[in-house]
């Protein structure tokens, strides 16, 4: 079996207020067979962004279509970026476990901080 | 209420063609990939095809494949299936099934019977 | 192929457990679904080896360990006669399959 990597290839992104702001991550295998979720930060204080799983999160879409079965793109946009979206966005691989599934692995997270406003 | 209603089943002879249909309602089609099982009389239940929630992609059982398409049409909430090449062996009722986030199923439709008989 | 007991019996407030046999548990999601007479509708009892559906009750439980998924009736009820067939998703090959089914008597 080929082990899972987490690639999340911009260790820096820069947005700008009220625009949308696109956070790539791809695994390389589908195994073991558990959901993708995005955290802001670390450790047990850290925010959930988005679980393809389950929930609402009307600021979220996803770059590709999550319901192909061979999909290995699980990158993000969020929209209306204000100042308090600035932070660390880690995609984190779970693989299932029962009654919770079971983190997995990280990607090593990319740090989303405001660039220079639009003149 | 969420409903998936199959349609377009009937008696057809070995060798002709049949279009299913499934009409959804009360949930985001597009949204949800979509699959076809079928039960053979007296016998389980049998995985036919999936189809992401996009359309772009499709899955098959290798017994089906090359005579059975899935597709679907997210402007009319609706998934088929076209079968061509009938044969007796096909004579089954025909479910549509909603997928689950992993590719399991939550929501069944009633079915529509599909007899294949000269 | 996956695994289950043609029929299984028991009597009422009694506890069933149906086994279903066959998947890895490194690429494998099961379910199980419900049928109550051939070519009625299935219903999903269990998704995702251990999720219920809200509208199902709570004394259907489902578990998976290692090769086999687990289908508990916990308080069985003469409603829940049926027939059970277990269901996976392999990440493998893309694939879903089904067991041949198993027949739940209520005495």
């Known amino acids: 079996e080929e082990e899972l990597q987490m690639i999340q290839p911009e260790k820096l992104l820069l947005v700008t207020v009220g625009k949308t702001a696109t956070l790539h991550c791809t695994v390389t295998s589908l195994l073991p067979v558990g959901p993708v979720l995005w955290f802001r930060g670390v450790g047990p204080g850290r925010e959930l962004i988005y679980n393809q799983k389950e929930g609402h999160f009307p600021r979220v879409t996803t770059v590709s279509d999550l319901t192909k079965r061979n999909n290995m793109d699980f990158s993000i946009r969020i929209s209306s970026i204000t100042p308090a979206d600035v932070g660390t966005y880690y995609c984190v691989k779970f693989r299932k476990g029962s009654p919770e599934n079971v983190e997995f692995k990280s990607g090593p997270g990319t740090e989303m901080a405001l660039g220079a406003k639009p003149s | 209420d969420l409903q998936l209603v199959e349609s377009g089943g009937g008696v057809v002879r070995p060798g002709e063609s049949l279009r299913l249909s499934c009409a959804a309602s009360g949930f985001t089609f597009s949204s949800y990939a979509m699959s076809w099982v079928r039960q053979a009389p007296g016998k389980g239940l049998e995985w036919l095809a999936g189809i992401s929630a996009g359309g772009s992609d499709t899955y098959y059982i290798d017994s089906v494949k090359g005579r059975f398409t899935i597709s679907r049409d997210n402007s009319k909430n609706s998934l088929y299936l076209q079968m061509n090449s009938l044969t007796a062996e096909d004579t089954a009722v025909y479910y549509c099934?909603?997928?689950?986030?992993?590719?399991?199923?939550?929501?069944w439709g009633l079915g529509t019977l599909v007899t294949v008989s000269s | 192929a996956l695994t289950q007991p043609a029929s299984v019996s028991a009597n009422p407030g009694e506890t069933v457990k149906i086994i279903c046999s066959g998947g890895?548990?490194?690429?494998?999601?099961y379910g199980w679904y419900q049928q109550k007479s051939p070519g009625s509708a299935p219903v999903t009892v269990i998704h995702s080896d251990d999720k219920r559906p809200s509208d199902i009750p709570s004394r259907f439980s489902g578990s998976a360990s290692g090769s086999a998924a687990t289908l508990t009736i916990t308080g069985v009820r003469v409603e829940d006669e049926a027939v059970y067939f277990c269901?996976?998703?392999?990440?493998?090959?893309?694939?879903?399959?089904f067991g041949a089914g198993t027949t739940l008597t209520v005495l």
């Open positions: 099934a909603r997928e689950t986030w992993n590719h399991l199923f939550d929501y």
């Open positions: 890895d548990y490194y690429s494998t999601y």
């Open positions: 269901g996976a998703y392999d990440g493998r090959t893309y694939i879903n399959t």
